[in-house]
């Protein structure tokens, strides 16, 4: 759709085009399967325009339908599905708070590979915090072209 001259003067955030692209900061301590993310121009090609980070987890600030995408490559990986290290290694993206909206949005299995990637459209609400859980003991790469996580506001 065409933007009016007044709309063209507004920052993207005020138009509802919230968007974020994050890179891996670190994995959690024992018993914490979450991946912790970071973003910002000082870190390279990661950024937050609207959404924010809360202790390494992505929090949504505007209601709408979002495209959620993620790729994770394992730096420490096992190619044999029979290995105790490798099975079952899964990545789950979900709303982890508020508890009343807790739900899994994406679930992926590494099977015999060392990289997974997926995306989906889903409605998200202001205050939703997205968590990415890597179960199993394998260790993800922090290379920014191998492991990344992002959301893009698509429509109200």
């Amino acid at each position: 759709q065409r933007l009016s001259r007044a709309q063209q003067q507004l920052p993207l955030e005020s138009l509802g085009w919230d968007i974020a692209e994050l890179q891996l900061n670190h994995t959690g301590p024992q018993q914490d399967p979450r991946l912790y993310w970071q973003g910002g121009p000082a870190l390279g090609r990661s950024f937050l325009r609207g959404p924010e980070l809360d202790k390494g987890q992505l929090r949504i600030r505007r209601d709408g339908i979002y495209m959620v995408h993620i790729q994770v490559t394992l730096a420490i990986c096992s190619s044999t599905s029979t290995s105790r290290h490798h099975h079952p290694t899964t990545l789950a993206v979900g709303i982890c708070s508020p508890a009343s909206r807790s739900i899994s949005l994406l679930r992926l299995s590494f099977h015999q590979g060392c990289t997974i990637a997926s995306q989906r459209l889903t409605p998200l609400a202001r205050g939703d915090t997205l968590c990415t859980n890597l179960t199993g003991t394998l260790l993800p790469s922090r290379n920014t072209d191998e492991t990344f996580f992002g959301v893009q506001w698509v429509r109200p």
């Epitope: 670190h26 024992q30 730096a75 420490i76 060392c114 922090r142």
Partner: antibody, heavy 120, light 108 residues
Framework: EVQLLESGGGMVQPGGSLRLSCAAS????????MSWVRQAPGKCLEWVSA????????FYAESVEGRFTISRDNSKNTLYLQMNSLRAEDTAVYYC?????????????WGQGTLVTVSS | EIVLTQSPGTLSLSPGERATLSCRAS???????LAWYQQKPGQAPRLLIY???SRATGIPDRFSGSGSGTDFTLTISRLEPEDFAVYSC?????????FGCGTKLEIK
């Protein structure tokens, strides 16, 4: 300057235990995964164990699994290897080694090693 | 487990000559995740090459790595006296991480 200093090696009888330490300095220790690598006298290098920067994920070679435990104390910038049920074939120089920032287990810095001798 | 076989076991050359060291894997190494190390007697290994061909920080450009799949090569274009040592390869694409048993580069 990155420095890794191992300690805790020595002579022990078969079935005994030892705890190795590796004191790290010159980098943000908690950011990096770490490994132990050993080398028996006149033999090849052998990877033993690895641990993520937070300490939440650990990895072991089959030859030591169930007997050795890797851990770290990020507040003390120290890596540990608890070695139980030691065997003659565990005799080696044990090195601690730092992973690349990406987490990939190639080792850009190594300590000078500590000798463990298992003998009756 | 990926077994790495290095050849030759010993290589006798003179300073100024070119050295070519081989590392062969028993199965394909994921994404060229292979490193080379130099080790001198009584010392810890020193990283030379990672990702099969990327030089580590501070490594002179006479050291170069190449290869993919199961066959990898470390080349020292012009040997300096300080280059005589043992050279080991390591794959880090698959658990467990494994090392070759080394090529000893000695002065002829």
């Amino acid at each position: 300057e990155v420095q890794l200093l191992e300690s805790g090696g020595g002579m022990v009888q078969p079935g005994g235990s030892l705890r190795l330490s590796c004191a790290a300095s010159g980098f943000t220790f908690s950011t990096y995964a770490m490994s132990w690598v050993r080398q028996a006298p006149g033999k090849c290098l052998e990877w033993v164990s690895a641990i993520s920067g937070s300490g939440g994920r650990t990895f072991y070679a089959e030859s030591v699994e169930g007997r050795f435990t890797i851990s770290r104390d990020n507040s003390k910038n120290t890596l540990y290897l608890q070695m139980n049920s030691l065997r003659a074939e565990d005799t080696a120089v044990y090195y601690c080694a730092k992973h690349d920032y990406s987490n990939y287990p190639y080792f850009d810095y190594w300590g000078q090693g500590t000798l463990v001798t298992v003998s009756s | 487990e990926i077994v790495l076989t290095q050849s030759p076991g010993t290589l006798s050359l003179s300073p100024g000559e070119r050295a070519t060291l081989s590392c062969r894997a028993s199965q394909s190494v994921r994404s060229t995740y292979l490193a080379w190390y130099q080790q001198k007697p009584g010392q810890a290994p020193r990283l030379l090459i990672y990702g099969a061909s990327s030089r580590a920080t501070g490594i002179p450009d006479r050291f170069s790595g190449s290869g993919s799949g199961t066959d990898f090569t470390l080349t020292i274009s012009r040997l300096e006296p300080e280059d005589f040592a043992v050279y080991s390869c390591q794959q880090y694409g698959d658990l467990p991480f494994t090392f070759g048993c080394g090529t000893k580069l000695e002065i002829k």
